[in-house]
Amino acid sequence: ATKLTEEKYELKEGQTLDVKCDYTLEKFASSQKAWQIIRDGEMPKTLACTERPSKNSHPVQVGRIILEDYHDHGLLRVRMVNLQVEDSGLYQCVIYQPPKEPHMLFDRIRLVVTKGFSGTPGSNENSTQNVYKIPPTTTKALCPLYTSPRTVTQAPPKSTADVSTPDSEINLTNVTDIIRVPVFN
């Protein structure tokens, strides 16, 4: 059974979350992808999305969010710059595939943003930074309004092998790791 796991990242205000979402490039390379926040009891809210079709390694910026889709590598890079405390929450990447429901990509990201300046960098496992020059050649993409009611966090269904199928359900596993992300001062 596929389990949609959650990783926790603790960052300070002003820093940058820099994550990657992994997808099957043969299936989804040019599909439109989105970054969503999931608030308890609510449907996921799309914050930013790539163009349709998604362009290879072409940065798309929506406010403080930058998306970059690497088709050859099956990776969507998501950066949230100049983090604020109110950015704390649960995030996920999805792939739009109308008329089917969006395909969710694991892992989900549990972001905790706290006030104050960061200390010394931690382990090399996870790299992020507190200042990032936003690329000059960014475009803003229009995102579909459609989000799946099946991804409401209050009622996560049972787990099956493929989270993209209409009947599939997701088992959110317990968060065991708190990953402290090193930052550049």
């Epitope: 990657k20 099956g74 790299s127």
Partner: antibody, heavy 122, light 107 residues
Framework: QVQLVQSGAEVKKPGASVKVSCKAS????????INWVRQATGQGLEWMGR????????GYVQNFRGRVTMTRNTSISTAYMELSSLRSEDTAVYYC???????????????WGQGTLVTVSS | DIQMTQSPSSLSASVGDRVTITCQAS??????LNWYQQKPGKAPKLLIY???NLETGVPSRFSGSGSGTDFTFTISSLQPEDIATYNC?????????FGGGTKVEIK
Amino acid sequence: QVQLVQSGAEVKKPGASVKVSCKASGYTFTSYDINWVRQATGQGLEWMGRMNPKSGNAGYVQNFRGRVTMTRNTSISTAYMELSSLRSEDTAVYYCARGGRTSIWSFVFDYWGQGTLVTVSS
Amino acid sequence: DIQMTQSPSSLSASVGDRVTITCQASQDISKHLNWYQQKPGKAPKLLIYDTSNLETGVPSRFSGSGSGTDFTFTISSLQPEDIATYNCQQYDKLPLTFGGGTKVEIK
């Protein structure tokens, strides 16, 4: 302790395929990307691509697309890199390397396999 | 692709000398730069990640600095065991790319 142990040296004829294995131990195999890097004799390091052991999804550098396949067997914590249609220029040492956590934009190779020499010769 | 230009390609210095290697990226890579040491017949070894962070267990005589396109790797006091080739690697954009390497020898 973290270890990546690769399969032994191979000699192949042009046009053949080679499959190199990389057995991981000392950490949770599915939590970190596995990358493949090659180095021809006297040359620099060349990244070939990466694989997420949790999902099995892989991505390859353009030069290798269509010839390389990266797979894994999570039950034995082993990653594989298969390169087909071999030519003499593919003669090199092939390394597997552990990358960052699967969800973070980090390609820091903190642990490497010992390398596998692949010789392509007629 | 981002080109990483390392200089010099080789150098010879005496034990105790300060050794400096530079790595220049063809475009801004922020601080997404790592340095590796490779001894003949061996796999590369991570020394410094994210421009300036010393990997656990690596002697403090190794250091790194820089940002954007220009980066520096320094050995404050060269030791006989430091004879090796040193490589920089960027990961700000895919594909990941390495510098051509700098071979360090003892005079």
